[in-house]
């Protein structure tokens, strides 16, 4: 005759408030004859959680049909879990007796603890934009989780980061905890399309971590490079000068032309294009009138990008005699 074993496979069961908890208990023998009851706690003050035959237990249901002839599964479900339900639960076999049933064997117990899911991680970047090659800080926060053990990782474009500091508060016992992590990220010129991801893994998430993201486009400023060139061809007595503003971000840009120090108000043609890396190119064309009297034209293309100090590029116009002859109306 096989000796009865009471099997409660889970030592710890984490449950969420409002959800249903399943407490497992199986027996290895049908003997001795007698009921299996569930208790919370031990000793004379233990609380009866479920008695199949009598009493009122509206929140408890059985997983299997306890009246089936060879039933060995005495697992129960407790609905609408509250913080008052935490504790260690024991399934206990009784042997029928007179006048009272006699406790025969207890399972090892399953501790029910409240698990609370962490809130969705919120990632905040720096207040001001920074240029490439500089380091910026991102913070990630998540709140309201329990138990305290939690794992937080940082990624940039799928690559795990190592330069970060994480704190979980409070350090002592609490019903819920918060995590805050600060990561230091070195900006690359191509980071306009990059993302930083904060990933939080917790036992309540059952292997499906929560993620918070921030776009580096909010944190980066890529300053433009300027190039002013004179087109070799001219139309009549006009020379076309091009100012190419390359690889800048964000889009906010003001461009002005100056001729010999005087700001030109007249309309200029321009185009804006977006590069694959998310930066922008801006091309502006300026038509300069050429005459015999104008050998010393200096053109300046000035760019004010994203509220920063203006940068400019100058071009001294090269008007050759040959060009002047070409543009002259007089015949020799």
């Amino acid at each position: 005759e096989e000796e009865l074993q009471m099997i409660q496979p889970e030592k710890l069961l984490l449950v969420t408030v409002g959800k249903t908890a399943t407490l497992h208990c199986t027996v290895t023998s049908l003997l001795p004859v007698g009921p299996v009851l569930w208790f919370r706690g031990v000793g004379p003050g233990r609380e009866l959680i479920y008695n199949q035959k009598e009493g009122h237990f509206p929140r408890v249901t059985t997983v299997s049909d306890l009246t089936k002839r060879n039933n060995m599964d005495f697992s129960i479900r407790i609905s609408s879990i509250t913080p008052a339900d935490v504790g260690t639960y024991y399934c206990v076999k009784f042997r029928k007796g007179s006048p009272e049933n006699v406790e025969f064997k207890s399972g090892p117990g399953t501790e029910m603890a409240l698990g609370a899911k962490p809130s969705a991680p919120v990632v905040l970047g720096p207040a001001a934009r920074t240029t490439p090659e500089h380091t910026v800080s991102f913070t990630c926060e998540s709140h309201g989780f329990s138990p305290r053990d939690i794992t937080l990782k940082w990624f940039k474009n799928g690559n795990e980061l190592s330069d970060f500091q994480t704190n979980v508060d409070p350090t002592g016992q609490s019903v819920a905890y918060s995590i805050r992590s600060t990561a230091r990220v070195v900006l690359d010129p191509w980071d306009v399309r990059s993302q930083v991801i904060c990933e939080v893994a917790h036992v309540t998430l059952q292997g499906d971590p929560l993620r918070g993201t921030a776009n580096l486009s909010e944190a980066i400023r890529v300053p433009p490079t300027l190039e002013v060139t004179q087109q070799p061809m001219r139309v009549g007595n006009q020379v076309n000068v091009t100012c190419q503003v390359r690889k800048f971000y964000p889009q906010s840009l003001q461009l002005t032309w100056s001729e010999n120090g005087n700001v030109c108000q007249r309309e200029t043609a321009s185009t804006l294009t977006e590069n694959k890396d998310g930066t922008y190119n801006w091309t502006s064309w300026f038509l300069v009138n050429i005459s015999d009297q104008r050998d010393d034209v200096v053109l300046t293309c000035q760019v004010k990008h994203d509220g920063q100090l203006a940068v400019s590029k100058r071009l001294a116009l090269e008007v050759t005699v040959h060009q002047k002859d070409q543009s002259s109306d007089a015949t020799p």
Epitope: V33, G45, L48, K53, T67
Partner: antibody, heavy 113, light 108 residues
């Protein structure tokens, strides 16, 4: 819906035996203990005993031991309480209840010569 | 056997007042096994409070139960006309199961 329907009122002579039935519906009688409770006129509740219909195991209060027999027929989902050697003080309403939570409507037994 | 003694035997109060009904056990009863029933004339008892402090389905929140060991209490915070009835405490901690003699809550 859980229901416990008891048999009708009985008038018995002292020394006689009465057998009251309690027909249940909405659940399987084998799943629960069936209890019987006495209430004499103008008095409180007194537990008589109970049966486990699954295996017919019974427990009785010492006051009723020897005079009471509780049985159950699982094929008809009916519990019975039989009280013998009736005396006038047995005049009471008798209730069946399922596992202490759901009660029948009561059966009045009058013992009178 | 465990003897349950309820006090007072009769409690005369007016609607709106607070009612406190006591149940004292001759030996310790686990709180899981202490129930209260309400009974009105000509009706079967109804389960009112189970496991010392849990209200049965549909029971108003003005009712509450408390206690441990040998002393248990049913409290009604503000009496409503429909609350006037007889209340019984009941233990099923050990055989034979026993009831208190009841407290009759009557309108003053």
């Amino acid at each position: 819906e859980v229901q416990l329907v008891q048999s009708g009122a009985e008038v018995k002579k002292p020394g006689a035996t009465v057998k009251i039935s309690c027909k249940v519906s909405g659940f399987n009688i084998k799943d629960y203990y069936m209890h019987w409770v006495q209430q004499a006129p103008g008095k409180g509740l007194e537990w008589i005993g109970r049966i486990d219909p699954e295996d017919a195991e019974t427990k009785y209060a010492p006051k009723f031991q020897g005079r009471v027999t509780i049985t159950a027929d699982t094929s008809t989902d009916t519990a019975y309480m039989e009280l013998s050697s009736l005396r006038s003080e047995d005049t009471a309403v008798y209730y069946c209840d399922r596992g202490l939570a759901y009660w029948g409507q009561g059966t009045l037994v009058t013992v009178s010569s | 056997e465990i003897v349950l003694t309820q006090s007072p035997a009769t409690l005369s109060l007016s609607p709106g007042e607070r009612a406190t009904l006591s149940c004292s056990a001759s030996s310790s009863v686990s709180s899981s096994y202490l129930y209260w029933y309400q009974q009105k004339p000509g009706q079967a008892p109804k389960l009112w409070i189970y496991s010392t402090s849990n209200l049965a389905s549909g029971i108003p929140a003005r009712f509450s139960g408390s206690g441990s060991g040998t002393d248990y209490t049913l409290t009604i915070s503000s009496l409503e006309p429909e609350d006037f009835a007889v209340y019984y405490c009941h233990q099923w901690s050990s055989y034979p199961y026993t009831f208190g003699q009841g407290t009759k809550l009557e309108i003053k």
